[in-house]
Every structure is written in C-alpha cells, then in structure tokens.
C-alpha cells in the first residue's frame, strides 16, 4: 500500500509510517516500527508535559521562588505545570506570575486613580486632555497644565499627556 | 545592585518622635519615587507615605496624615520618615522601598515600638 502522507489526531508521521503520540504526563522513548508501538515513558517527578506529544524531553515544573515573593498556588502534577502566585499583600507581574511587586506605577501620560492596597494594585487611568503626567508613579495624578493666561503669558508649546505646556511673553508688537 | 538601608528605629514612648533613615544606594536615588512602608506583628503591609523624585510631591495615609513627614536629601542618597505624636498603633517594622517595588528593591527594616 501506499505510505501515508498525513496521519490521524493524536498520532504523527515518522518513516512514511504513522506512530501513536504520546500521551500528557508521559514523553517520547523511541518511535514505533512496523512492528512495535511507540515506547512512552512517565515523566519525572518535577516535571511535565501538556499535551500529546513526541518529546523526549519532560518540561521542569516551574519554581515559585520565595526570594521573588513567590508561593505556590497549585502544585504541578505530570500533565500540569505548577501554579505561582505572590505572597499576601503582593502583586504579580504578569498573568504568568514570574515575580510580585508592591504594587505597579503607572508610566507617563497616566495618573493615579487609586493607591494600591494590600488586596488591589495600584489603579491607572489615562491623562485626559489639559492635564499631563512625566514621571512614573504609585501615587500620583494627573496634574493641570500651566494656565499661561493667569501668569499674563501665552502658549509658545501645547502640553501633552506627557508634558506641561510651555508659556512665553506676550508678543508686545501690534500690526 | 540595589541597596537600602533603613535606620532610626527604636523604643519610644506614646507622644515620642522618632526620625527614620533610608540610605540608598546602586541607583541614580533623584531619579526614583520612594516609599515608606510598614509592617505591624501579624498583619499585612501598610503603605505609610510616599515622595517624587524631586521632591515636590508627597502622599500620607489617613492613619498618618498631620502626624508624619517625609522627606529626601538627593544630595546624600537619603530618605527620611520623621515620626511625631507616636501612638502604640505605629508599632511596626518600617520598611524603604523603590519602583518597581520588587522583592529586591526594598530594605530589611527598622523596628519602631511604641510603648509606655
């Protein structure tokens, strides 16, 4: 017969011939023959793998490190990775949790809504327009631009959400 | 590497002051937002107050506001947190810390007690 081009779900093509993947929680010890099927093998005991596969090699389980403020969640098993989340009162990073802060700033052109707390990060909203914010920061809001006419001064630079407007004297010559 | 020493803790009786310390170091200290935080026997940790980089800017929490000062001397690499009207609620390890506020940008703490 003809050898196969493509193979079923949960299987792969290897010497024109199709072979069992192996299954979550176990890897690749060698590819089947025409006489013999795919030899898996248990992943070790801090290690993983998700899917069906044909990995000769088991992924580490992930270490919440403590120094990092990390905890563990949810242990890792031989089909899942283990689970990170930050000590009480922290926050984490990124949806992946590879390390906490105290709480996040929010980066120029944003301001402070509200404060971190020790259950919620610090709240960022975006400067609106007459208002501007150059540093980054946990407490901070928006400020006001300069009002050049309250100083008898007239804009020379429009202000940004990132930077104060310019004032400059006024153009004393007439037409 | 990131190094803030904190310092100035102590006894001190309610109605005492106490002036804490914040020496930095590793950093370009002008260019960061710092913070003070605290850390009572057995609960979570308090945001206490906070200065801009320059200066020009401060934050108190509530329970400190009227009674707390902080400051920074950019020309030592020093932050300050002076204490006045101490109550025994104040008890607590104090903490400096820098953005971002990671585990590795903040000190080791000073014990302040209150107590008579």
């Known amino acids: 017969p003809e050898p196969p081009t493509a193979c079923r779900e949960k299987q792969y093509l290897i010497n024109s011939q199709c072979c069992s993947l192996c299954q979550p929680g176990q890897k690749l010890v060698s590819d089947c023959t025409e006489f013999t099927e795919t030899e898996c093998l248990p992943c070790g005991e801090s290690e993983f793998l998700d899917t069906w596969n044909r990995e000769t090699h088991c992924h580490q389980h992930k270490y919440c490190d403590p120094n990092l403020g990390l905890r563990v969640q949810q242990k890792g098993t031989s089909e899942t990775d283990t689970i990170c989340t930050c000590e009480e009162g922290w926050h984490c990073t990124s949806e992946a949790c590879e390390s906490c802060v105290l709480h996040r700033s929010c980066s120029p052109g944003f301001g402070v809504k509200q404060i971190a707390t020790g259950v919620s990060d610090t709240i960022c909203e975006p400067c609106p327009v007459g208002f501007f914010s150059n540093v980054s920061s946990a407490f901070e809001k928006c400020h006001p631009w300069t009002s050049c006419e309250t100083k008898d001064l007239v804009v020379q630079q429009a202000g940004t959400n990132k930077t104060d407007v310019v004032c400059g004297p006024q153009d004393r010559l007439r037409a | 590497e990131v190094q803030l020493l904190e310092s100035g803790g102590g006894l001190v009786q309610p109605g005492g002051s106490l002036r804490l310390s914040c020496a930095a170091s590793?950093?370009?200290?002008?260019?960061?937002e710092m913070w003070w935080f605290r850390q009572a026997p057995g609960k979570g940790l308090e945001r206490v107050s906070?200065?801009?980089?320059?200066?020009?800017?401060?934050y108190y929490a509530d329970s400190v506001k009227g009674r707390f000062t902080i400051s920074r001397d950019n020309s030592k690499n020093t932050l300050y947190l002076q204490m006045n009207s101490l109550r025994a609620e104040d008890t607590a390890v104090y903490y400096c810390?820098?953005?971002?506020?990671?585990?590795?940008?903040w000190g080791q703490g000073t014990l302040v007690t209150v107590s008579s």
């Open positions: 906070a200065i801009s980089g320059s200066g020009g800017s401060t």
């Open positions: 590793g950093f370009t200290f002008a260019g960061y």
């Open positions: 810390a820098k953005d971002p506020y990671s585990f590795d940008n």
